[in-house]
Amino acid sequence: TQNKALPENVKYGIVLDAGSSHTSLYIYKWPAEKENDTGVVHQVEECRVKGPGISKFVQKVNEIGIYLTDCMERAREVIPRSQHQETPVYLGATAGMRLLRMESEELADRVLDVVERSLSNYPFDFQGARIITGQEEGAYGWITINYLLGKFSQKTRWFSIVPYETNNQETFGALDLGGASTQVTFVPQNQTIESPDNALQFRLYGKDYNVYTHSFLCYGKDQALWQKLAKDIQVASNEILRDPCFHPGYKKVVNVSDLYKTPCTKRFEMTLPFQQFEIQGIGNYQQCHQSILELFNTSYCPYSQCAFNGIFLPPLQGDFGAFSAFYFVMKFLNLTSEKVSQEKVTEMMKKFCAQPWEEIKTSYAGVKEKYLSEYCFSGTYILSLLLQGYHFTADSWEHIHFIGKIQGSDAGWTLGYMLNLTNMIPAEQPLSTPLSHSTYV
């Protein structure tokens, strides 16, 4: 007779990342008896929800239920039915919803209310939808990558699980780029964190971590582009904006009302003598870079050193994982290799931005024009942000590792968020006495 396999004693968790440009659903799985061990949780599925971010549903909240259906049904298929009622579901909304809340708390609450009602109709253990803070977003991203890299494990391995992993227990810093915000999080070297808002203290697996984090709202790649356009149109002599961040020959009409819709452009808002303007690409990396630098105020710093806009930033320390849009953009541009120096990246960007739009469209025929048109800006923005914003240098560039996945799990805040909410990161080493919930992160 054939041996029947014993049913797996596993658990599942679902996190929805409600970002500014889209929503993604992640399904995680782990062995039930090992949930306090480090590195046992892994991602089994990612489902990208079709459509924009949830903040765009403010005038059509009745469509939210349908919007979420496909990915929630996918979760129903992937997770065994017997596990449905025990599977927690969390939704975390990030900077897109932070911006909507700044405009109108009532409208943001309306969206979240309908999101919660829609998600509660599935057979899972729904645990709520909320707007996470920028500090949480940075912290959970840092927890995710270090958990996946095995940095919290006390056992020193003789082998590497990923190419860029060093075998020491020094944690990686986390660099996260979204559409509406960007986060920088790392453990500084013996440096006092001069601003309390940027300081986090963790005790994880028996070790204390003093972590620096900051989230720059409006400095995600999409909002940064809106900022740049709002800034540049101020000095345009007519309704044509010759833009170095777009390929030569590229043309696009922008509504002024769309430009000023976001709180991120308020500081540049002015009465213009036209309702629309046309972007005409001229494809010049250097000029694009210069225009982007004007978004960073580096003239004021009340601390020993700053990133930009008067925000404290300690000296950079150790290796960094750069993920989310840092990775997607650099991957598209074929610039994620460890061997590519910062000088080489700059050279490649100069060439890429100078390529005519018609040529670009032919070379990347399968890519949506909306996304394709913005890679020159996004790539230049990433360089500007890392070099001038965060003070990476040609030498320290090699410490930036552009990461999409680590051992099959996406780098990002969602895994860290779930680990925390399910109490799977103990403060002490798991072999000690059972812990009360208060001792967790």
Epitope: I64, L112, E116, R117, S118, S120, F126, Q127
Partner: antibody, heavy 121, light 107 residues
């Protein structure tokens, strides 16, 4: 002052359906959510589901999913709760109640007088 | 779902005395908790929301306290009209859930 007026008592056979109504008067109907809560004789309160009339968005307790349908008619400021495949255990008073707030504020500040539904063969 | 547990099931109190009712949530609900009063043959009435805020028209003798998982409803000096069943309800996470109720009866 908002008032919720519910339809009269019903006697139903097992396996059939019941549709109770809840009409709002004296206030803005659409923007508030309406919950349905039932109470079996001598028992506690049990939430069944909720709807935001303006959006038509309804959500239901797991126990009743597939058997209950909550709808709303904005033109008459009326919410309906239909429960199908009735059994004797569904004998209860069915209340509609207004949720006073929005996101994470689902306190029930105005209640209807209740509709008694008896399921008996 | 969040399970709400009320204690005691029955509380016998003399008029003019203080009554203390407890409600416990199976997980933290912050301060997203309401208390209701129900008299025989009547619909429930909202007394307290946000764990400690009295609803419109509710006398000052009713007070609520607590947050997270432990909550208390206190009636400082029981009047004859206060003898009823009291329910707590969490409204942090769907589904909305009620406690089993505490019957406050005349001693």
């Amino acid at each position: 002052q908002v008032q919720l007026v519910q339809s009269g008592a019903e006697v139903k056979k097992p396996g059939s359906s019941v549709k109770a109504s809840c009409k709002a008067s004296g206030g803005t109907f659409s923007s508030y959510a309406i919950s349905w809560v039932r109470q079996a004789p001598g028992q506690g309160l049990e939430w069944m589901g909720s709807i935001i009339p303006i959006f038509g968005t309804a959500n239901y307790a797991q126990k009743f999913r597939g058997r209950v349908t909550i709808t709303a008619d904005e033109s008459t400021s009326t919410t309906y709760m239909e429960l199908s495949s009735l059994r004797s255990e569904d004998t209860a008073v069915y209340y509609c109640a207004r949720e006073s707030g929005g996101y994470r504020d689902h306190r029930l500040d105005v209640w209807g007088q209740g509709t008694m539904v008896t399921v008996s063969s | 779902e969040i399970v709400m547990t009320q204690s005691p099931a029955t509380l016998s109190v003399s008029p003019g005395e203080r009554a203390t009712l407890s409600c416990r949530a199976s997980q933290s609900v912050g301060s997203n908790l309401a208390w209701y009063q129900q008299k025989p043959g009547q619909a429930p009435r909202l007394l307290i929301y946000g764990a400690s805020t009295r609803a419109t028209g509710i006398p000052a003798r009713f007070s609520g306290s607590g947050s997270g998982t432990e909550f208390t409803l206190t009636i400082s000096s029981l009047q004859s009209e206060d003898f009823a069943v009291y329910y707590c309800q969490q409204y942090l996470i769907w589904p909305l859930t009620f406690g089993g109720g505490t019957k406050v009866e005349i001693k």
